[in-house]
Interface confidence: low
């Protein structure tokens, strides 16, 4: 399985309730020797890997903020976070969330959801999801929380810049052509005058009149702006999606290690010839 975050940025006005969500994709094992822990904590945006640092959410550590599987009853510690405006929820389809009630700017930060697969009490795999919560101070900053993807806004910004550059280029083209045309006119007028002068001074000697127009000082050099294709191809930031415990691991983790099935090896696909 893997962990995804539907949204990577939540912007909330002070006093609102913020519900941050993670989702587990693929079947998940909670067999007799396999346990799945889902929890939340605050972290910081590390240079190499996000979610490395563990900080409590409203003084509750990740041990206090565990989601319990549908078949197990929550223990007493599960109720305590609710008194501090923290609520955990999960459903049968892998969605799990933490709700922070009555948010303040102090709640702002990078929130990480962590899913740990334990086999015989030993961590087998860790999956992370991360999202940024920005709490805007003051009551006049809006009525509800807005959830979005930073990746989306990045690509939208890139597209907007590219589009803007194109429009500016198209609008400026006639002006540039006009200026070039006028410059050439001035140059050819000068040359005509020179020729007349020469003709009057030294008759019979021709001037080849090289058409090397001097560079126009107002025109920007092409190298100062990257080509549009570069702007459009800018990669969106990862923002913590599908991050595993080891930064070198691939983004799509291997299948679960698993199920009601603790010990058996993965079975290869049946050959297509067996399909009926």
């Amino acid at each position: 399985f893997k962990v995804t975050t539907p949204y990577s940025l939540y912007v909330c006005p002070e006093g609102q309730n913020a519900t941050l969500t993670c989702r587990i994709l693929g079947p998940v094992s909670k067999g007799h020797d396999v346990t799945i822990y889902k929890t939340w904590y605050l972290s910081s945006r590390g240079e190499v890997q996000m979610c490395k640092e563990h900080r409590p959410i409203r003084n509750f550590t990740l041990q206090h903020l565990q989601h319990h599987g549908s078949h197990l009853k929550a223990n007493a510690s599960h109720d305590q976070p609710q008194k501090h405006g923290l609520e955990l929820a999960s459903d049968h389809h892998g969605n799990f969330s933490i709700t922070l009630r009555n948010v303040t700017p102090r709640d702002s930060g990078l929130y990480c959801c962590l899913v740990i697969e334990l086999k015989n009490h030993h961590p087998e795999q860790r999956f992370y999801g991360s999202m940024e919560l920005q709490v805007q101070a003051g009551k006049g900053s809006g009525s509800t929380c807005m959830a979005s993807n930073e990746q989306d806004s990045d690509s939208i910004t890139a597209a907007a810049l590219a589009t803007g550059a194109c429009i500016v280029g198209i609008l400026c083209l006639p002006l540039i052509l006009l200026l070039v045309y006028k410059q050439r006119q001035v140059a050819s007028h000068r040359r005509a005058q020179e020729l007349v002068r020469m003709d009057s001074n030294t008759q019979g000697i021709e001037n080849p009149g090289f058409e090397t127009t001097p560079p126009f000082q107002g025109m920007p050099e092409a190298k100062t702006r990257p080509p549009l294709s570069y702007v459009a191809q800018r990669q969106p930031s990862e923002s913590g999606r599908y991050l595993l415990s080891d930064p070198s691991t691939p983004l799509s983790p291997p299948g679960p290690g698993d199920v009601f099935f603790p010990s058996l090896d993965p079975v290869p696909d049946s050959p297509n010839s067996e399909a009926i």
Epitope: S29, S70, H71, L72, H92, G94, F260, P266
Partner: antibody
Framework: QVQLVESGAEVKKPGASVKVSCKAS????????MHWVRQAPGQGLEWMGV????????SFAQKFQGRLTVTRDTSTSTAYMDLSGLRSEDTAVYYC??????????????WGQGTMVTVSS | QFVLTQPSSVSGAPGQRVIISCTGS?????????VHWYQQLPGTAPKVLIY???DRPSGVPDRFSASKSATSASLAITGLQAEDEADYYC???????????FGTGTKVTVLG
């Protein structure tokens, strides 16, 4: 819509093997466990085993260990149940059933139409 | 084979209320595992009626309800109707058998 279509009825001799297929459609095959349940004529339901289509891992009821093989073909979204060493008491309707949620121990929300397997000499 | 015990049959007149019990042990219902209920109409595949102890899938009438206590569960059908005549099975995961265990099944007969 979500559905499971099983292969047709089979008549087998004692000691032989039977392979029943179950083709899934209308949902992401690898996202939900697939179970096999059987029902002998006039009897109750009996859970046989389960496969995780995501990675092919399986688990079986103790009674069927060694005789039951469950596989899947993700390219065709099909699960297969292979029961060997057939005996007369294996005469039953065999159902495949999709699990409802992604968690262990969830209910089975979609069932195949059933495949009647008759073991007779 | 059948670890969950159900009454073999219950009956009631149309409009009546019937209750089907499902008794387990400390390794299944008592261990906290969810109980699910299935309805099997004659000649058809089972259909999930209740999942997760008491939740009803969409399309299942609210005449059907279920609850769970220590090591047992029960299914109630209120306002019994002719189309409710079917076999009913409870099921839960058993931690010692490492398998889903079905109840023995209960045949519901609508009188009249």
């Amino acid at each position: 819509q979500v559905q499971l279509v099983e292969s047709g009825a089979e008549v087998k001799k004692p000691g032989a093997s039977v392979k029943v297929s179950c083709k899934a459609s209308g949902y992401i095959f690898t996202d939900y466990y697939m179970h096999w349940v059987r029902q002998a004529p006039g009897q109750g339901l009996e859970w046989m085993g389960v496969i995780n289509p995501y990675d092919g891992r399986t688990s079986f009821a103790q009674k069927f260990q060694g005789r039951l093989t469950v596989t899947r073909d993700t390219s065709t979204s099909t699960a297969y149940m292979d029961l060997s060493g057939l005996r007369s008491e294996d005469t039953a309707v065999y159902y495949c059933a999709k699990q409802m949620g992604i968690w262990d121990y969830d209910a089975f929300d979609i069932w195949g139409q059933g495949t009647m397997v008759t073991v007779s000499s | 084979q059948f670890v969950l015990t159900q009454p073999s049959s219950v009956s009631g007149a149309p409009g009546q209320r019937v209750i089907i019990s499902c008794t387990g042990s400390s390794s299944n219902i008592g261990a906290g595992y969810d109980v699910h209920w299935y309805q099997q109409l004659p000649g058809t595949a089972p259909k999930v009626l209740i999942y997760g102890n008491s939740d009803r899938p969409s399309g299942v009438p609210d005449r059907f309800s279920a609850s769970k206590s220590a090591t047992s569960a029960s299914l109630a059908i209120t306002g019994l109707q002719a189309e409710d005549e079917a076999d009913y099975y409870c099921v839960a995961w058993d931690d010692s058998l490492k398998a889903y265990v079905f109840g023995t099944g209960t045949k519901v007969t609508v009188l009249g």
